[in-house]
């Protein structure tokens, strides 16, 4: 599960919602440490998506998220463009004026799914860019 | 100039820092309207980064920015992978556990720098993803 | 057409600091690197250094303890100071201005007329 | 830094004949960053070639440069009364930009 942490980086929500079906998920939001940009777990349930109807299988799949902060100085697990090391320099000196770089998926991989199409006939689909392999500051 | 706003996609420093000589850049962090994902001016001189001494030329270079929201809906303007609408979705759910997706560069453009290497050699150098070409959700 | 003029005291004495100044006409000093070379008589040419318009500086390490090259944008000017002279450093000292993108840099074009700086007592 | 010896140190010819001149580097000049001058008595020194090979504006087409690495050649295929002159090299690949000790082109 991801660690629990407070993460400035991102727009949060006042909604609360019930959590109970996303176990594999920590909350991001409630502790004081801000961690560096990197992977994180999440598995997404298309029951919980409203997807079960159409899709047949698989359930749900590993599809992970990117999140963190992307601070100086970037370091080679950051995966940084060279334009992410320049905003980031940019960002120390006008911090009001330019953001961080954001910690994005660098890599992702397909899955397939299984599902019935608008004329009910089932089609096995190659879903590119579903899985996040690696996160980057971009 | 990138137009101001709040945007609370971001850290904020509270330094507040001398931005006279960069006026190709809008403060984004002053209107309470967050714009969506998109690409924004900004110009950056080397001279700024302390670079001056070893680059020869150019003296700076349009690199934009990428910022803004990744909300739900995201529309086709959005370059939305596969992964980031399904966050956006999980998001919607789950507000308090998986951020939105980022704004991030989508496409970005190489420029070619002159500069002096730790031997005082001239190099003209081609560096790869410098400038920012189009922004999406990731 | 771009024109560089030298101007400064022809008899600098031992000990003391040569100064002279380049003044810049027919085309902003914005934008180009402006170089100091200097020919004793008789004899070849040598680099002191360059700057920028927006004052950053490399000059030749023989000489960097003791040269200062400086830039007066708003008067269309730069200036060389170099300071400790002895005979060894009379020359003619030219201006000359440096072509300042990835396409075009490091040779000298044009360059001022020159001024002929004699160090004596 | 890179030192540019240029030969002959004179090189005494006729008008009508052809002037070639060398230039050799100490090491490697870098994109053939490399410049020739000439230069007439009481005057500055004028561009003629830079990047080696590519002849400056108003420079007569008699002119030419070539070579790489740590050769350098300037060539004057025909030479006129008013070419005869001293002709420098310089090289902008490394720092200190440093320039050879001349080749003076005399009457012969």
């Known amino acids: 599960a991801a660690n629990k942490r407070k993460n400035q980086n991102r727009n949060k929500s006042s909604s609360h919602q019930d959590s109970s079906r996303m176990s594999s998920v920590g909350d991001y939001n409630t502790s004081e440490q801000k961690q560096a940009c990197k992977k994180h777990e999440l598995y997404v349930s298309f029951r919980d998506l409203g997807w079960q109807d159409w899709i047949i299988a698989p359930e749900g799949y590993a599809a992970f998220y990117c999140d963190g902060e992307c601070s100086f100085p970037l370091n080679a697990h950051m995966n940084a463009t060279n334009h992410a090391i320049v905003q980031t320099l940019v960002h120390l000196m006008f911090p009001d004026h330019v953001p961080k770089p954001c910690c994005a998926p660098t890599k992702l991989n397909a899955i397939s799914v299984l599902y019935f199409d608008d004329s009910s006939n089932v089609i096995l689909k190659k879903y590119r860019n579903m899985v996040v392999r690696s996160c980057g500051c971009h | 100039a990138a137009n101001k706003r709040k945007n609370q996609n971001r850290n904020k420093s509270s330094s507040h820092q001398d931005s006279s000589r960069m006026s190709s850049v809008g403060d984004y962090n002053t209107s309470e309207q967050k714009q969506a994902c998109k690409k924004h001016e900004l110009y950056v001189s080397f001279r700024d980064l302390g670079w001056q001494d070893w680059i020869i030329a150019p003296e700076g270079y349009a690199a934009f920015y990428c910022d803004g929201e990744c909300s739900f809906p995201l529309n086709a303007h959005m370059n939305a992978t596969n992964h980031a609408i399904v966050q956006t979705l999980v998001h919607l759910m789950f507000p308090d556990h998986v951020p939105k997706p980022c704004c991030a560069p989508t496409k970005l453009n190489a420029i070619s720098v002159l500069y002096f290497d730790d031997s005082s050699n001239v190099i003209l150098k081609k560096y790869r993803n410098m400038v920012v070409r189009s922004c999406g959700c990731h | 057409q771009v024109q560089l003029q030298e101007s400064g005291p022809g008899l600098v004495k031992p000990s003391e600091t040569l100064s002279l100044t380049c003044t810049v006409s027919g085309d902003s000093i914005s934008s180009y690197y402006w170089s100091w070379i200097r020919q004793p008589p008789g004899k070849g040419l040598e680099w002191i250094g360059y700057?920028?318009?927006?004052?950053?500086?490399r000059y030749n390490p023989p000489l960097k303890s003791r040269v200062t090259i400086s830039v007066d944008t708003s008067k269309n000017q730069f200036s060389l100071k170099l300071s400790s002279v002895t005979a060894a450093d009379t020359a003619v000292y030219y201006c000359?201005?440096?072509?300042?993108?990835?396409?075009?840099?490091?040779?000298?074009?044009?360059w001022g007329q020159g001024t002929l700086v004699t160090v004596s007592s | 830094e890179i030192v540019l010896t240029q030969s002959p140190g004179t090189l005494s010819l006729s008008p009508g004949e052809r002037a070639t001149l060398s230039c050799r580097a100490s090491?490697?000049?870098?994109?053939?960053?490399l410049a020739w001058y000439q230069q007439k008595p009481g005057q500055a020194p004028r561009l003629l070639i830079y990047?080696?090979?590519s002849r400056a504006t108003g420079i007569p087409d008699r002119f030419s440069g070539s070579g790489s690495g740590t050769d350098f050649t300037l060539t004057i295929s025909r030479l006129e009364p008013e070419d005869f002159a001293v002709y420098y090299c310089?090289?902008?690949?490394?720092?200190?930009?440093?320039f050879g000790g001349g080749t003076k082109v005399e009457i012969k």
């Open positions: 000359a201005r440096i072509c300042s993108s990835t396409s075009c840099w490091g040779w000298f074009d044009p």
């Open positions: 990047g080696a090979s």
């Open positions: 700057i920028y318009y927006s004052g950053s500086t």
């Open positions: 310089q090289q902008y690949g490394s720092s200190p930009l440093t």
């Open positions: 090491q490697s000049v870098s994109s053939s960053y």
